[in-house]
């Protein structure tokens, strides 16, 4: 799978994690930081 | 399946204010960024602002900043563009457009006709 | 704000004709610009995004391609239903349309 950082418009959409751009399914995902979850991070789970 | 429909076409005299509601059905306007984009008759694309709904941030062009507002109402999934102090150039058709984790998504369009 | 200079305006051509439309940023928008149709008394329908993806049930006959500041659009072979409206977009930083390009048959 071909990825890369998302556009410069994205910065702040994924609240606690990183944004990255899928090339082959145009997606724009959000990798979450280690006890958060949700379509932008942006829920906390214990 | 997503939809984004918008209210119904308007008629405003010069100097009133007008404001576009876009209702999302089919995901959460938390999850996405709302645009708005106009198109006078017989011209170009033209990009206004948007929205973060999530964070309740706004991000305008420079020529309507002061003029426009966008706003979002998470409980029922609707954003809105109000503007004001409408000229008859501000007639054009205004379109609300999701973005996100997808690529652009449009709603229907709202016809705005300002005139004395 | 990124400007988007796109050209032609407008463009008559016959119908099997190349059609080549450009777009030239301001400054590097890294590959982010779609491409957009448009036909008298209909919202934009997105052809292309991310420079050259092709949209689920675009002809094939259209594509892109660039990088960095330049970027292109072709019809490789035009035909009858092509005659519309085309737009650049680039959605790096914020979002700017290029200007538009009207494509007419001879």
């Known amino acids: 799978v071909s990825i890369t950082k998302c556009n410069s418009d994205m910065n702040g959409y994924c609240l606690h994690g990183q944004c990255i751009y899928l090339v082959d399914m145009s997606q724009n995902y959000c990798r979450c930081e280690v006890g958060y979850t949700g379509v932008r991070c942006e829920h906390f789970y214990l | 399946q997503d939809q984004l429909v918008q209210s119904g076409a308007e008629v405003k005299k010069p100097g009133a204010s007008v404001k576009v509601s876009c209702k999302a059905s089919?995901?959460?306007?938390?999850?996405?960024?709302i645009q708005w984009v106009r198109q006078a008759p017989g011209q170009g694309l033209e990009w206004m602002g948007r929205?973060?709904?999530?964070?309740?941030?706004?991000k305008y062009r420079e020529k309507f900043e002061g003029r426009v507002t966008i706003t979002a109402d998470t409980s029922t999934n609707t954003a809105y563009m109000e503007l004001s102090s409408l000229r008859s150039e501000d007639t054009a058709v205004y379109y609300c457009?999701?973005?996100?984790?997808?690529?652009?998504?449009w709603g229907q369009g709202t016809l705005v006709t300002v005139s004395s | 704000d990124i400007q988007m200079t796109q050209s032609p305006s407008s463009l008559s051509a016959s119908v099997g004709d190349r059609v080549t439309i450009t777009c030239k940023a301001s400054?590097?928008?890294?590959?982010?610009i779609a491409w957009y149709q448009q036909k008298p008394g209909q919202a934009p329908r997105l052809l292309i995004q991310?420079?050259?993806t092709l949209q689920p049930g675009v002809p094939s006959r259209f594509s892109g391609s660039g990088s960095g500041t330049d970027y292109t659009f072709t019809i490789s072979s035009l035909q009858p239903e092509d005659i519309a409206t085309y737009y650049c977009?680039?959605?790096?930083?914020?979002?700017?349309f290029g200007g538009g390009t009207k494509v007419e048959i001879k």
């Open positions: 457009v999701r973005s996100g984790r997808e690529f652009d998504f």
């Open positions: 089919g995901f959460n306007i938390k999850d996405t960024y």
């Open positions: 929205i973060d709904p999530l964070r309740r941030q706004t």
């Open positions: 400054q590097d928008i890294h590959k982010y």
């Open positions: 991310y420079t050259s």
């Open positions: 977009l680039q959605y790096d930083n914020l979002r700017t």
